[in-house]
Interface confidence: low
Amino acid sequence: LVVTPPGPELVLNVSSTFVLTCSGSAPVVWERMSQEPPQEMAKAQDGTFSSVLTLTNLTGLDTGEYFCTHNDSRGLETDERKRLYIFVPDPTVGFLPNDAEELFIFLTEITEITIPCRVTDPQLVVTLHEKKGDVALPVPYDHQRGFSGIFEDRSYICKTTIGDREVDSDAYYVYRLQVSSINVSVNAVQTVVRQGENITLMCIVIGNEVVNFEWTYPRKESGRLVEPVTDFLLDMPYHIRSILHIPSAELEDSGTYTCNVTESVNDHQDEKAINITVVESGYVRLLGEVGTLQFAELHRSRTLQVVFEAYPPPTVLWFKDNRTLGDSSAGEIALSTRNVSETRYVSELTLVRVKVAEAGHYTMRAFHEDAEVQLSFQLQINVPVRVLELSESHPDSGEQTVRCRGRGMPQPNIIWSACRDLKRCPRELPPTLLGNSSEEESQLETNVTYWEEEQEFEVVSTLRLQHVDRPLSVRCTLRNAVGQDTQEVIVVPHSLPFKV
């Protein structure tokens, strides 16, 4: 990657305009604060890619990091990302704004951190203070990053002087959290139960010999305590388990169950929580919409998918025109219902190489002893259009007729066009569309029939030509949602002794 100007640090004037260019052997992109600002991307004749970022009417808020990176999904190597830092000294901007989460620095161990107070001008002197103290702290400052060091649990502010005024930053709070080395995991036999069923939770701690378990759960708040059982998993050393078992759950037992584990030697502790839902009775609920009309294309495979939530696990049946469907031995139909989470299911009907006979009314029914749901839709088989016949005739009336017949589903549209210059048409001259216009001296009559058994439409269109004084190429084009088909016939005047 080549960046112009190369940086790595630039100081630009407020209100000015500045152009950054990045080029590379693959597509490149400029990034600012994890986003891609508007930029012009190009590819040169020699295969080099470039991106030009124009910064207009610069303010202090444009101060910060700019990255040029390859615009693809491959893992970035070190030379695939160039960093540029731009300062725009702006006396109207004191400290650059921080996101709320940057003001609160949570620590889990004694480690070096950075208080990210940054200014727009690299020449400014910046000092760090405890929030309630005037003494500047002896911590190194990097204008691009902030103050880095090991900090106590306190609140801090940065100060600088711009012109003749002293400016304070927002307060930064350093907060040391006690995170234990205890590794706790909580799981439930089921996180959804019906009232009257049992709730059973397990809290497991690894790597400690002496621990204390404390459970918090909805029933405890009302003073109805449940005695957990603690045991050692003998096949795994230092695996201790606490089991909380609530028989015959009530609706009030819904809520958060927390297992808090402490070990007194180092005063370490950890806790994990899990949500349990107690429902009055079982349920089946459809998720998302499935349109009442679905389409499949003839001879292609089509999967119809229904997503739903249910507890307890339901029975799922599919019907076509009120007849139960099952996996066909010929492999034409495949049914599957997958449990994608504890209570979420995906049921799929796959039609392999769809046939016309598979059009019809489909229903999926999911049910158990407490509830049921069903979803129905009509399946239409779309058939690409075919022109079956294009013929020309000379009735006694003196006019000439061309008849075009074709089929397809959904109903095809018919387009007639003609070309008088056979040598140049249709490559050089566009054909003329024909219709019911007297100018073109042609008349059109179209009939549409729906064939129930084949489940497709037939279109028959007759084009009447009043005066054909020289050979004419007439084209019939049929079009529908899944394709188009064209045939062409040459119509010659009555006087000419041949037909093509």
Partner: nanobody, 124 residues
Framework: EVQLVESGGGLVQAGGSLRLSCAAS????????MGWFRQAPGKERDFVAA????????HYAESVKGRFSISRDSANNMVYLEMNSLKPEDTAVYYC?????????????????WGQGTQVTVSS
Amino acid sequence: EVQLVESGGGLVQAGGSLRLSCAASGRTFNGYAMGWFRQAPGKERDFVAAITWSYGYTHYAESVKGRFSISRDSANNMVYLEMNSLKPEDTAVYYCAADPKASRFRTLRRYDYWGQGTQVTVSS
């Protein structure tokens, strides 16, 4: 023994404002998280907002963000909930709660001490 006493509830028109107060006593609250919860008739108790006593770091439920504001006055051991643009669905009993582990204030789980609650009714 920790005691929490709420006040400031009442009847207000939709779009109006109320300020709830919670007087905390019985100990110093450094290292505590203080929270407001609410319970509408026939519903579970829901988290509304929390604040850490020492540093004043705040956290809000999505449904009240931008309308409610939590604050504390450590000198007088008070916690406040400023409620603006009130809606009928804000009608509930509002409880003040205290958790001795401030680092947990985002988890909304374990508040060891609770007040008796104050009724807020928003009419349409």
